[in-house]
């Protein structure tokens, strides 16, 4: 039992790791200019998307490079616990927190807002510089969508790196696992062609979601054969000439649910890597 | 003045640095063993590639797969001078070879062997399970682009390293350079379409000119458009029919010059890298 | 649909220039690696590659004829020009023009124009 | 140079039109079909594949400087004028075949 409650302590655990936060401000300042920097790079490769073949290339090419870049930026995430591990067995030890409140408040003061930022930036600079879709909801919902494949992403590393001492081992085996997940997101392949044997894999893939999301996102309602009225006179099976008919090539479900159910994943992902780094966490109090 | 030659040296250098390779064979082994898996993956994944819209994704996503692969995979080139640094400095000073013995020994015996059996494993692999153009120069071809580019990253990786001596802060450098150089290289942006102020990035791409004698040599005569009669149907301006539309598009240029440039700019790089990589070892010896 | 259209003088004398017109659709002369070949080919002989124009206005002449040739374009019109000053009845033949990439044989032709040079 | 500027067949007959180039040409090899009054039509490019709508029966090979065009079992729509074209340097048409019923 705890003289103080839940609510305190995490409210004075998120306190101090923002402090630290603020305190230490190279990393955060560095982290940011890096992404503004990558943004405008991006921005400015990309600047100004044509509504022909090469723009579907494009489009496809950015989407994807976004989705992976958060999602290989977030193996840094496996450092939130293991750096501190020590602290932390001290300090849950001496009764300072439970560690359901240490968990939380990392979570709050540190993650949220370190992966937050990234999808923020990269949307508000990329989003305009390319001429992506011009609708407010297609613009929250890129942010929405490269927050939560950061959310998951970072889940996953605090998954794989609680409770460890060492980063290195862990940042080796996120890797691995995201050079997996990249092949099967979508892009280099056409999942609609792997075996089946070998298709359920894609379902673990979190760039997979992601970029399946800000495809559908932005694809929907396009046209890509400047001059021809695609939607009435397209004789041809093997152009492609709108959004539609590129989404449904990649085996991309065109409906509301095809857009939502990705970030659904996401969000169960997030879930369960999450209560596996709190159970990693409080098997180790157990042996420390 | 040295009482042996630069031969003698050279050899004698190259047996040493091969009995350490014999002598220590876990790692070698384990190189070979993890290209072997990651070769039959990605066979599995993009087994028996299709001729229609699918089989250009496929073609142009496993061919960028592998490029890039060749280039981030010969990070680990990084440690040839590093690790040895003070044993270099120290039979450098007591007079036992040349710096240049010493360089080329540990290319020949180390570099080359190491950086060759990869691209012949994948190539034997893939090739067949994939069922790439079965015609045996372009089998051939595929191996050596493969080879090529992975001398050039690994001489990237010396001209950054020699001279070093923590891997870390090279391997950092190596590997934004590669997320870099993997923009530029043709598959997630459309080289013609970007501007004329940011294209000539495109020139220091070591995946830019793999990947693009790979498509050269996979592409060229190739059909995509099963059961069309495309010169009197031509309702399909907007579809790739052909392996030569999608490499106009791409900005390949057809002919035969437009393969081989690839093998010679990359020959140019490995030429210069390691004439870098030579000069710091010079350099390194002045201040020893 | 792509199509290509000839259109020439039908006869001229000897010692005039030959001016020639491909009107084309279905395509445009400013997208990347789009080239416009013209061909000829006399009457009962075979086939003689001209000249060719592409997308960045770079052009290339047959070796044994190029002091003799001249080929533009006009993007907007969606048209190429060849000119051939001071003809002769060597120069009778079928005038064809031909859509292409900038390294690829010729898939898209048009149905050709018939030219005299006759006194 | 092509060969053989013409060439008699019986419908049902395997025949076979070559080309040499003065040099190397990597394959860069195109073959084309013209029936009187028409413009030619593309049947063969890169040596050996087939233009779609092209029919099976028809086929290409060679490298280097040699190159054959076969058709495997002649048809009275085939009868036409056969060319060779090597697109590796600019573009140069072979003479031609001219191909009839016996």
């Known amino acids: 039992s705890y003289t103080t409650s839940f609510c305190h302590q995490l409210r004075w655990v998120s306190k101090r790791s923002f402090k630290n936060l603020l305190g230490n401000p190279q990393a955060s300042i560095a982290q940011i200019i890096v992404t503004v920097i990558l943004g405008l790079v991006i921005g400015a490769i990309y600047f100004g998307l044509n509504n022909d073949s090469t723009g579907i290339q494009n489009r496809a090419g950015v989407l994807f490079f976004l989705t992976t870049n958060q999602c290989f930026s977030s193996v840094s995430a496996v450092e939130l616990f293991v750096v501190e591990k020590k602290l932390f067995i001290h300090e849950y030890i001496s009764g300072y927190y439970r560690v359901s409140s240490y968990f939380f408040g990392k979570l709050l003061s540190d993650l949220l807002p370190m992966r937050m930022l990234p999808s923020i930036i990269f949307t508000c600079i990329v989003y305009f510089m390319l001429g992506l879709k011009p609708t407010a909801d297609a613009f929250f919902i890129m942010m929405f969508t490269l927050m939560m494949v950061a959310y998951s992403a970072s889940s996953m590393a605090l998954a794989i790196a609680a409770g460890q001492s060492v980063v290195s081992v862990a940042t080796l085996l996120m890797t691995i696992c995201f050079v997996f997940m990249m092949i099967f997101s979508g892009l280099l392949v056409n999942l609609t062609t792997i075996a089946s044997w070998l298709s359920w894999l894609q379902y673990f893939s979190i760039p997979r979601y992601g970029f399946t999301a800000l495809q559908h996102n932005e694809f929907l309602g396009q046209n890509f054969c400047p001059g021809l009225n695609a939607t009435v006179n397209n004789t041809c099976n093997y152009a492609t000439c709108t959004g539609e008919e590129y989404l449904t090539k990649q085996g991309i479900d065109l409906s509301p649910w095809g857009l939502w159910k990705n970030h659904v994943a996401l969000a169960c992902m997030i879930v369960i890597f999450l209560t596996i780094a709190y159970l990693k966490l409080l098997f180790l109090k157990k042996y420390s | 003045s040295y009482t042996t030659s630069f031969c003698h040296q050279l050899r004698w250098v190259s047996k040493r640095s091969f009995k350490n390779l014999l002598g220590n064979p876990q790692a070698s082994i384990a190189q070979i063993i993890v290209t072997v898996i990651l070769g039959l993956v990605i066979g599995a994944i993009y087994f028996g590639l299709n001729n229609d819209s699918t089989g250009i994704q496929n073609r142009a996503g496993v061919l960028f797969f592998l490029t890039t692969n060749q280039c981030f995979s010969s990070v680990s080139a990084v440690e040839l001078f590093v690790v040895e640094k003070k044993l270099f400095i120290h039979e450098y000073i007591s007079g036992y070879y040349r710096v240049s013995s010493y360089f080329f020994g540990k290319l020949l015996s180390d570099l080359l062997p190491m950086r060759m059996l990869p691209s012949i494993i994948f190539t034997c692999i893939v090739y067949f399970m994939l069922g790439l153009k079965p015609t045996a120069d372009a089998f051939f071809i595929m191996m050596f682009t493969l080879m090529m580019v992975a001398y050039s990253a690994s001489s990237m990786a010396l001209a950054i390293a020699a001279g070093q001596s923590v891997v870390s802060v090279a391997t950092l450098l190596m590997t934004i350079c590669f997320v870099f150089m993997m923009i530029f290289s043709g598959l997630l942006v459309n080289l013609t379409t970007i501007a004329s102020w940011l294209s000539w990035l495109q020139y220091f791409s070591i995946p830019r000119y793999g990947f693009t004698a790979l498509q050269h040599n996979e592409f060229l005569g190739q059909n995509f458009c099963p059961g069309l009669n495309a010169t009197v149907n031509n309702t399909c301006n907007y579809a790739t029919c052909t392996g030569e539309e999608y490499l106009t598009k791409q900005g390949i240029d057809l002919s035969p010059w437009g393969l081989w440039k690839n093998h010679v700019a990359l020959a140019c790089m490995i030429v210069i890298f390691l004439t870098i990589a030579y000069l710091k070892l010079l350099f390194l010896k002045k201040y020893s | 649909q792509v199509t290509l259209k000839e259109s020439g003088p039908g006869i001229l004398r000897p010692s005039h220039t030959l001016s020639l017109t491909c009107s084309f659709s279905g395509f445009s002369l400013t997208t990347y690696g789009i080239c416009v070949s013209w061909i000829r080919q006399p009457s009962g002989k075979g086939l003689e590659w001209l000249a060719n124009i592409c997308w960045e206005d770079s052009k290339a002449y047959n070796p044994s004829l190029k002091n003799r040739l001249t080929i533009s374009k006009d993007t907007s019109n969606n048209q190429v020009f060849l000119r051939i000053p001071s003809v002769d009845t060597a120069d009778s033949a079928i005038y064809y023009c031909a859509r292409v990439f900038n390294n690829y044989p010729f898939p898209y032709w048009g149905q050709g124009t018939l030219v005299t040079v006759s006194s | 140079t092509q060969s053989p500027p013409s060439l008699s067949a019986s419908l049902g007959d395997k025949v076979t039109i070559t080309c040499q180039a003065s040099?190397?040409?990597?394959?860069?090899v195109a073959w084309y079909q013209q029936k009187p009054g028409k413009a030619p039509r593309l049947l063969i490019r890169?040596?050996?594949t087939l233009e779609s709508g092209t029919p099976s029966r028809f086929s290409g090979s060679g490298s280097w400087r040699d190159y054959s065009f076969s058709i495997s079992n002649v048809e009275s729509e085939d009868i036409a004028d056969y060319y060779c074209?090597?697109?590796?340097?600019?573009?140069?048409f072979g003479g031609g075949t001219k191909l009839e019923l016996k």
């Open positions: 074209l090597q697109y590796v340097n600019l573009w140069t």
């Open positions: 040099q190397n040409i990597n394959k860069y």
């Open positions: 890169y040596t050996s």
